[in-house]
Interface confidence: low
């Protein structure tokens, strides 16, 4: 339905908090290096505007697009040039062309200051201080680091950071009670932006198509009771919330999410037994818990599949008729008897499955010809199951660091030219499968496995776009998105690459390393074993381990030295020449 | 670096044999489907056979059905064509190409290609 004016909607809609809230986060995403106070002050304008267009909605500018007006307030900054360079060229540009030029300019690695945590007395007396810009500020430092952060989702965050600070900020152990819930909210915050970043990637990328298989798949899992037609229904919203947050439309995309999430609450009944708690909850709850909610219970009895999509003599003919409503149907049907399976296994199944039909039914007896396909099945689903077998069983021998060290060398040969800092940070997640899935039952490993790879991988994908140095990477993360996984577990050792140049530098420590985290000192070794491996791609897993073994014990002695750094400079020479006379560098 | 190479062409006599194969070398076929393409001079290149990664699904364009066989021996990395009954149309380039675990309905589909190797089929 047509409003007047489109600001005024949303505003009314959403209720000015969320609306500025909003509207901060679209500018952070977009405008990545500008300074908070720029963004507060565009922000309060934006709102401002948006008041007088409540009042009267025919009062001037009120009727103009939100990207029209959004993207005029963007170009009134003043050091739009300097600051970012071509995207400035973006104003020259009319809508919808300049919102389009304003996301190609987004940036999933930008360059900025890591975020540092302030002592927790600093940060409560910054809270009691001044509340609403502390929560401002943090909804402006994490949309600036992920451009494509879910927007309704972070405002669910924020108010979980802000009832953190109000409980902990009165605690007699104020540090005690904080630092966990921080350290939860970043970790699960992380995995958050990095699953939405996949699901951008598949709308912009691979396009509406994909994203709507990929959601038949999932919510036919998790609803496995609804009919075809809910299901579709829940797709075709869900796509459209989801489009709309990942081209920057972040209050349409709140708005569409709040009336979905209100849709499926009333109808309870005919999606899912498992939404009555999500149901009770406050709106941006209400929302998180259904994205979350548990899998509903298989109805008893399905039928066999093979009555409807191979035995039938309307195969052919229902498929012809409607080709994507018939795969939509197989992949329904497939998708809600198979909990256990990874939702990219489901889309290749079906995949197969278009394939064969494609052929079978322009041939001369269709029937004869995909009788067999269920047989294709078998390898596509045990590939997989075999990989989380094999790598589960690595991950309980090695436990999770040499686990991701495993990988950390496996990757590296696989495609050696990616940046070290890329392949630290795609490994050591890759390695967190381990821990994260592997103590599932099987009937959980690889819906769990396998659709956690494809968001590590993705972001792989996405940091490698920025700066493509790898054919490799290109074409596994182009050619398919359902076939990433199984294309990078195909790459041998890159043959073609020639070895790095030693370098003794990289390979020179210091004592501050001995004040790092866990973490930080884990970084720094497997930055350091990622430099071996370029450095000398044929070493042997034996090599490489004796290696690092004593860089261990290097590390570990020089800490407990009285005179760190020098023990560092001279100890450092030695482990050096060793490492280059046990490798052959 | 990934490479697949054919071998096994040449000249034969019409309702003669040949075997052709594709090695691949810097990846693992394993999780590969293998598909044949032959181009004929001045014509377009043509889907001759195809077979998924498992080895489980096979196909074959009509004109070459009951004639040509396609297996795969993933311990040697490599995909044979076991070519018998040929014709003088069967002359032409025939290549290889590997696409991720299913069998491509387009040409453009398939990831890596080989470089050819030249079939004669004449009396």
């Known amino acids: 339905d047509a409003h007047k004016s489109e600001v005024a909607h949303r505003f009314k809609d959403l209720g000015e908090e969320n609306f500025k809230a909003l509207v901060l986060i679209a500018f952070a995403q977009y405008l990545q290096q500008c300074p908070f106070e720029d963004h507060v002050k565009l922000v309060n304008e934006v709102t401002e505007f948006a008041k007088t267009c409540v009042a009267d909605e025919s009062a001037e500018n009120c009727d103009k697009s939100l990207h029209t007006l959004f993207g005029d307030k963007l170009c009134t900054v003043a050091t739009l040039r300097e600051t970012y360079g071509e995207m400035a060229d973006c104003c020259a540009k009319q809508e919808p062309e300049r919102n389009e030029c304003f996301l190609q300019h987004k940036d999933d690695n930008p360059n900025l200051p890591r975020l540092v945590r302030p002592e927790v007395d600093v940060m409560c007396t910054a809270f009691h201080d001044n509340e609403e810009t502390f929560l401002k500020k943090y909804l402006y430092e994490i949309a600036r680091r992920h451009p494509y952060f879910y927007a309704p989702e972070l405002l669910f965050f924020a108010k979980r950071y802000k009832a953190a600070f109000t409980e902990c900020c009165q605690a007699a152990d104020k540090a005690a009670c904080l630092l966990p819930k921080l350290d939860e909210l970043r970790d699960e915050g992380k995995a958050s932006s990095a699953k939405q970043r996949l699901k951008c990637a598949s709308l912009q990328k691979f396009g509406e198509r994909a994203f709507k298989a990929w959601a038949v798949a999932r919510l036919s899992q998790r609803f496995p009771k609804a009919e075809f037609a809910e299901v579709s229904k829940l797709v075709t919203d869900l796509t459209k919330v989801h489009t709309e947050c990942c081209h920057g439309d972040l209050l349409e995309c709140a708005d569409d999410r709040a009336d979905l999430a209100k849709y499926i609450c009333e109808n309870q009944d005919s999606i899912s037994s498992k939404l009555k708690e999500c149901c009770e909850k406050p709106l941006l709850e209400k929302s998180h818990c259904i994205a979350e909610v548990e899998n509903d219970e298989m109805p008893a009895d399905l039928p066999s599949l093979a009555a409807d999509f191979v035995e039938s003599k309307d195969v052919c003919k229902n498929y012809a008729e409607a080709k994507d409503v018939f795969l939509g149907m197989f992949l329904y049907e497939y998708a809600r008897r198979h909990p256990d399976y990874s939702v990219v296994l489901l889309l290749r199944l079906a995949k197969t499955y278009e394939t064969t039909l494609e052929k079978c039914c322009a041939a001369a007896d269709p029937h004869e010809c995909y009788a067999k396909v269920f047989d294709e099945f078998k390898p596509l689903v045990e590939e997989p199951q075999n990989l989380i077998k094999q790598n589960c069983e690595l991950f309980e021998q090695l436990g999770e660091y040499k686990f991701q060290n495993a990988l950390l060398v496996r990757y590296t040969k696989k495609v050696p030219q990616v940046s070290t800092p890329t392949l630290v940070e795609v490994s050591r997640n890759l390695g967190k499968v381990g821990s994260k899935c592997c103590k599932h039952p099987e009937a959980k490993r690889m819906p769990c496995a396998e659709d956690y790879l494809s968001v590590v991988l993705n972001q792989l994908c996405v940091l490698h776009e920025k700066t493509p140095v790898s054919d490799r990477v290109t074409k596994c993360c182009t050619e398919s998105l359902v076939n990433r996984r199984p294309c990078f577990s195909a790459l041998e050792v890159d043959e073609t690459y020639v070895p790095k140049e030693f370098n003794a530098e990289t390979f020179t420590f210091h004592a501050d390393i001995c004040t790092l985290s866990e973490k930080e000192r884990q970084i720094k070794k497997q930055t350091a074993l990622v430099e071996l491996v370029k450095h000398k791609p044929k070493a042997t897993k034996e090599q490489l381990k004796a290696v690092m073994d004593d860089f261990a014990a290097f590390v570990e002695k020089c800490c407990k030295a009285d005179d760190k750094e020098t023990c560092f400079a001279e100890e450092g020479k030695k482990l050096v020449a060793a490492s280059q006379a046990a490798l052959g560098l | 670096e990934v490479q697949l190479l054919e071998s096994g062409g040449g000249l034969v006599q019409p309702g003669g044999s040949l075997r052709l194969s594709c090695a691949a070398s810097g990846f693992t076929l394993d999780y590969y489907a293998i598909g044949w393409f032959r181009q004929a001079p001045g014509k377009e290149r043509e889907g001759v056979s195809c077979i998924a990664s498992s080895g489980g699904s096979t196909n074959y364009a009509d004109s070459v059905k009951g004639r040509f066989t396609i297996s795969r021996d993933n311990s040697k990395n490599t995909v044979y064509l076991q070519m018998n009954s040929l014709r003088a149309e069967d002359t032409a380039v025939y290549y290889c190409?590997?696409?991720?675990?299913?069998?491509?309905?387009?040409?453009?589909?398939?990831?890596?290609w080989g470089q050819g190797t030249q079939v004669t089929v004449s009396s």
């Open positions: 190409a590997a696409a991720v675990l299913e069998c491509r309905t387009v040409v453009r589909g398939y990831d890596y």
